[in-house]
Interface confidence: medium
């Protein structure tokens, strides 16, 4: 058993040009957190899967509100380490993720916002027992530097924490073939108990008689590299010499077995024996329970009430993952039609629409004379942004469902007065003039300037425009 | 009259990035969207994304996600894209466009910048 | 997202006559499809836009026609500054994409 440690020197702007701008502003004050997720082994997992290690959230930094004009600083840190305790032995390569997230203070419906503002990961090798190891990493135009140590908790010692120390018997020495426990001269390794030829860099043991082998070892001693099998090559020593057979790998080449957990042979597979806090099939799954609260981002934990049982995170809205530790880009979805711009507001999407449309998502054109239909036999005309009705005679409006007053216009010329009627006007027509705007003078010998005067209506007759 | 001012060319080293810029005139700058669009030699155009210099919403192209970043200056009526770990793939004429928000798409462009990434 | 494919790639005419060029769309964009010109030494110029609406300034031998999938620019009476590059564009969905081009010559 040990502590991983973590401190956080600073974040703030990388070196280079595109400084970031301050994530906090004077009208949205923001702090920050970390989160640091521990994996097991080199391997490169996706950033989703279990942090079977273990993980640690901060506390949250001082609230910080950007200088208006100044770049982004270096931004204030929260104080004291982060600590992910180990159960087990530490496995000496393991994958770390160091997010670190931004809480926005502003007035936010149903409490603070949390956004991930960068995420830094690696892989290394580290004894524990050893001095701090200092790192820099870049996420895009952020930088975070830190240091990071493995410590044994008493009485567990060595690179793996896997040695464990007893207070001296005899005020002298220690007991036949046990060595000092160093730093802690004044103790003792007690004796081992794992099981016989168990390997003392690459083996360890909990209980008397066992022997589990560290990331990247296997065999019933762990002596055995997991990118080799038992036998060397078909080349090589032959079978009656070694004791193994050279045809096929067998079904624990490779150590199916992730987080320590070591390999058997049964007759159709294997079987792996986990160490504690892990369990499944390969030993895949970590023994986190809902009390650790492994849910972020406001997730609902269901299950996990012990190790033994699995938990599961509940996601809220516009987060995923199996941790609820990755947001959700509904926008990627390109949910807003006509150009219009998508605002992932949490609990809700919104679409900005263009000038000339609306809707939700925008589906809707202001300007679309399709199925918009002008009443009383006016006809759609398309422009401008606005889709208009150009309405027939006595209509007006923007569908043409008011009734308009056909005279407001003047539209009987050279004097003419005008009289609505039911199907649009009547002009009556000054003496000189006719026609059905009055628009045509009559010559004094009486004739018209029109062919002739239709059927049944005089010169100076009322004249009803159709 | 409406104007995007983009310089000529930019020549940078791979794995850098570059900031490139077009300043609006001749219209109210936060009135209206603006559009970057890329044109590699001998090739069609690719919609990078939009943004609003209102307050800085922007929508991109998935393809340019985590490549090409937009940003405004109100106080010059600048846009600005930047493109980050530069490769040969990068290496291309970019345009800015102005959206008329009407329903009209991009009415005003700008003249270009030719990005050439080489060591 | 919506592929666009345009045709033909080339095109070879003489002034005063008129030319077509087509465009088909992947899936339905309603009528939301734009054209463009492109020539050197000038900026781009927006002709038409929703299928078929003249952009100002324009001159009226520039048509587009179409909607749902497939859309038409006519161009009648061919001018000198005519002979450029062309591209269609939808701007229903993002990402907005183009046309492959088309590359008209004086014959």
């Known amino acids: 058993a040990g502590v991983f440690e973590l401190q956080i020197h600073s974040f703030g702007p990388g070196p280079g040009p595109g400084a970031p701008r301050s994530p906090c502003s004077a009208r949205l004050p923001c702090r920050l957190f970390f989160r640091v997720c521990l994996k097991p082994g080199l391997s490169e997992e996706a950033a989703e899967s279990p942090c079977a290690l273990g993980a640690a959230l901060s506390a949250r930094g001082p609230v910080y509100t950007e200088q208006p004009g100044a770049p982004a600083p270096d931004l204030p840190l929260p104080d004291g380490l982060l600590q992910v305790p180990f159960r087990d032995a530490w496995p000496g390569t393991f994958s770390f993720i160091i997010e670190t997230w931004r809480e926005e203070l502003g007035d936010q419906i149903g409490g603070p916002a949390w956004s991930l503002l960068a995420r830094v990961a690696g892989r290394r090798r580290l004894a524990a027992g050893g001095p701090w190891a200092r790192d820099i990493q870049r996420a895009g135009a952020w930088e975070l530097r830190f240091s990071y140590r493995a410590r044994c908790e008493p009485p567990a010692v060595g690179t793996a924490c896997t040695r464990l120390c007893r207070p001296r018997s005899a005020p002298s020495r220690c007991g036949p073939g046990l060595r000092p426990c160093a730093p802690l001269e004044d103790e003792c390794e007690a004796p081992l108990v794992c099981r016989a030829g168990c390997s003392p860099e690459h083996g360890f043991c909990e209980q008397p008689g066992e022997c589990r082998c560290l990331e990247g070892w296997t065999g019933p001693l762990c002596t055995v590299p997991v990118s080799t099998s038992s036998c060397l090559s078909p080349r090589g020593p032959s079978s009656a010499t070694t004791g193994c057979l050279v045809p096929g790998p067998g079904p624990c080449d490779g150590n199916p077995c992730a987080n320590g957990g070591s390999c058997s042979e049964t007759p159709r597979s294997f079987e792996c024996t986990c160490p504690r806090g892990f369990y499944g099939l390969r030993c895949e799954v970590s023994g986190v329970t809902c009390a650790d609260g492994p849910c972020f981002n406001g997730g609902l934990c269901v299950g996990g009430a012990d190790p033994d049982s699995a938990y599961i995170c509940h996601c809220p809205p516009g987060f995923q993952g199996s941790n609820c530790e990755k947001r959700v880009d509904r926008c990627s979805l390109q949910p807003c039609r006509n150009g219009g711009l998508c605002l992932d507001l949490g609990h809700a999407l919104r679409c900005r629409c263009r000038a000339g449309f609306a809707g939700p998502r925008c589906e809707h054109d202001l300007d679309d004379c399709a199925g918009r239909a002008c009443a009383n036999g006016g006809t759609c005309v398309e422009g401008g942004g606005a889709h208009r009705c150009s309405c027939a005679l006595g209509f007006g409006g923007r569908d043409c469902r008011e009734r308009a007053d056909p005279c407001a216009a003047r539209p009987c010329a050279h004097g003419g007065r005008c009289y609505a009627h039911f199907s649009g006007l009547v002009c009556a027509c000054a003496p000189g003039y006719m026609g059905a705007r009055c628009e045509f003078p009559v010559h004094p010998d009486g004739a018209s300037a029109l062919p002739a005067a239709p059927p049944g209506l005089r010169p100076g007759d009322p004249q009803r425009y159709l | 009259q409406v104007q995007l001012q983009q310089p000529g060319a930019e020549l940078v080293r791979p794995g850098t990035s570059v900031k490139l810029s077009c300043k609006a005139s001749?219209?109210?700058?936060?009135?209206?969207?603006m559009h970057w669009v890329k044109q590699r030699p001998g090739q069609g155009l690719e919609w990078i994304g939009v943004?609003?210099?209102?307050?800085?919403?922007?929508n991109y192209n998935q393809e340019f996600k985590g490549k090409a970043t937009l940003t405004v200056d109100t106080s010059s009526s600048t846009a600005y894209m930047q493109l980050s770990s530069l490769t040969s793939e990068d290496s291309a004429v970019y345009y800015c466009a102005r959206d008329s928000t009407v329903v009209a798409p991009m009415d005003y462009w700008g003249q270009g910048t030719s990005v050439t990434v080489s060591s | 997202d919506v592929q666009i494919t345009q045709s033909p790639s080339y095109l070879a005419a003489s002034p005063g006559e008129t030319i077509t060029i087509n465009c088909r769309a992947s899936t339905s964009i309603s009528k939301y499809l734009a054209w463009y010109q492109e020539r050197p030494g000038k900026t781009n110029k927006l002709l038409i836009y929703?299928?078929?609406t003249l952009q100002s300034g324009i001159p009226s031998r520039f048509r587009g026609s179409g909607s749902g999938t497939d859309f038409t620019l006519t161009i009648s009476s061919l001018e000198p500054e005519d002979f450029a590059m062309y591209y269609c564009?939808?701007?229903?969905?993002?990402?907005?994409?183009f046309g492959g081009g088309t590359k008209l010559e004086i014959k």
């Open positions: 943004i609003d210099p209102s307050d800085s919403l922007a």
């Open positions: 564009q939808q701007h229903h969905v993002y990402p907005y994409t």
């Open positions: 001749g219209y109210t700058f936060t009135s209206y969207w």
């Open positions: 929703s299928g078929s």
